[in-house]
């Protein structure tokens, strides 16, 4: 009654296709699988960025797996073969682990990489990224931005840089077709006659960095003797009404009366007959139904009513 053993997968490696963080993990079947021809072998794959507390774990019958990583750090992965209990007339059999690592050999002292990278997807239409040059780099240093997301054949370089003193300090992106709800990868590298420049890698999803335009067409309507309805419209653009949250700031007679967050384009306010002046502004943000995060828009233009009976006039700006 010999103990059943199985070898780990062969040729386990992490392959970088040049997608700025989207890597391929691939392997070959273990040696000596002949005894288990009737069996579907599975593989348990564990991987993580070095420094991460937790491993991601995948069980697959395939010989490859793809995922995104932070290339600022190294990557480690391990894999072993699993023989299901059906193949062994008993309990599941596991091979030893095959392990591999991957990292981009760095160049340049960390301080030379770009500082304060900031990307905003304006109105879910126009992506703009900006950065500051690394510490202590000379004016001959130039930074270049490359990006990739699933759907592009290869990483693309920015073609419309924002410049200051002849240095690239930002990028205006072209129209990015079918680019939201997926990882968007960026690398900013650099060159200098004086010293090597450290590359930086960034990953985000576009829908999470949207800054909408502010709401428009703010109006007042008297609903009753003690209620006023504030209304506004969503700004022009591709963001549907269902994706907005709003924050309203209302001032009554020069004191802040209310700050409120609402999901609709209306807000009903209780007032008194003594109210002499009422002003409000609104700003918008993409809500949790459409993104995991977002950036508040600028405040709308202020809409005010003063000195007239609101029941006699609806104000429209």
């Amino acid at each position: 009654d010999t103990e059943i053993k199985v070898n780990p997968p062969q040729d386990f490696e992490i392959v970088d296709p040049g997608y700025l963080g989207y890597l391929y993990l691939q392997w070959q079947p273990p040696l000596s699988l002949d005894h288990f021809k009737e069996c579907t072998v599975e593989y348990e794959l564990k991987y993580r960025n070095i420094g991460s507390e937790t491993w991601k774990t995948i069980i697959t019958k395939n010989l490859h797996y793809k995922d995104g990583f932070d290339l600022n750090k190294g990557i480690e992965a391990k894999i072993h073969t699993l023989l299901p209990w059906q193949c062994t007339n008993g309990s599941e059999v596991q091979s030893s682990w095959a392990e591999t690592t991957y990292w981009i050999s760095p160049q340049g002292i960390p301080e030379t990489k770009v500082q304060d990278m900031d990307c905003v997807y304006y109105n879910w239409q126009y992506l703009l990224c900006s950065w500051k040059p690394g510490i202590g780099v000379l004016l001959d240093t130039n930074y270049n931005l490359f990006y990739w997301y699933e759907g592009l054949d290869h990483a693309l370089q920015c073609v419309d840089y924002i410049k200051a003193d002849g240095q690239n300090i930002g990028c205006r992106f072209p129209y990015l077709e079918a680019s939201d709800y997926k990882d968007f990868y960026i690398c900013v590298n650099g060159s200098s006659e004086n010293k090597p420049i450290r590359s930086s890698y960034f990953t985000f999803q576009l829908q999470n960095i949207v800054k909408p335009l502010p709401p428009v067409y703010l109006t007042f309507t008297r609903e009753s003797s003690c209620e006023i309805k504030l209304k506004w419209s969503i700004p022009l653009g591709p963001i549907p009404a269902r994706c907005f949250d709003y924050e309203i700031e209302i001032r009554e007679d020069d004191t802040t009366l209310v700050t409120a967050t609402v999901e609709n384009e209306t807000y009903t306010l209780k007032t008194t007959n003594e109210t002499r002046q009422l002003c409000f502004v609104v700003r918008s943000k993409v809500n949790i139904y459409c993104s995991d995060d977002g950036i508040w828009s600028e405040w709308s233009d202020k809409q005010c009513w003063e000195g007239e009976d609101l029941s006699k006039k609806t104000l429209l700006r």
Epitope: P106, I109, E111, G136
Partner: antibody, heavy 116, light 108 residues
Framework: QVQLKESGPGLVAPSQSLSINCTVS????????VHWIRQSPGKGLEWLGV???????DYNSALMSRLTISKDNNKSQVFLKMNSLQSDDSAMYYC??????????WGQGTSVTVSS | QVVLTQSPAIMSASPGERVTMTCTAS???????LHWYHQKPGSSPKLWIY???NLASGVPARFSGSGSGTSYSLTISSMEAEDAATYYC?????????FGSGTKLELK
Amino acid sequence: QVQLKESGPGLVAPSQSLSINCTVSGFSLTKYGVHWIRQSPGKGLEWLGVKWAGGSTDYNSALMSRLTISKDNNKSQVFLKMNSLQSDDSAMYYCARDHRDAMDYWGQGTSVTVSS
Amino acid sequence: QVVLTQSPAIMSASPGERVTMTCTASLSVSSTYLHWYHQKPGSSPKLWIYSTSNLASGVPARFSGSGSGTSYSLTISSMEAEDAATYYCHQYHRSPLTFGSGTKLELK
């Protein structure tokens, strides 16, 4: 296993130049950078520069005009050349492997004395 | 350049005693790039703690590191004879890379 070994002349006359070799084994110079550091009672540990895996070099700006770091990937060797030595350049000179922005393995060092 | 000031310069501790030494940077340094090295007489420095708080391979669990910005420390929870050595902090953030002048830890 990872090893680095420095070899140098030991004694150098003032105003002459110093050449030290660092021979590495257990890793490839195409994957890892190598730093040069020196240590003396007067100045403590002083970073001289680094030859990155990709071939570029960073130097300590205070010594840049006197330093050249080069390498031969095929021979697994990194070279330090320093010109115009003075007595305060007397020190133990180390090479060390760069790994994830730290120096994870050091050679045993080679002692350099500048004296006539 | 970033000057790293270590204190005390020399200290002694009895077996079992808790030991703390500090490293103060003249400019803020990212915790990712602050490391500690350990050196015994006649030997080369060894990486001991990397990225402020991660122990290098083979370093006993009684060692720990902490800090951020300009203030960092290395602690030994219970001194042992083999811990007697000189400890150097090192910043890898800004050029030129620099080291502290060391804390020499002696066995009392």
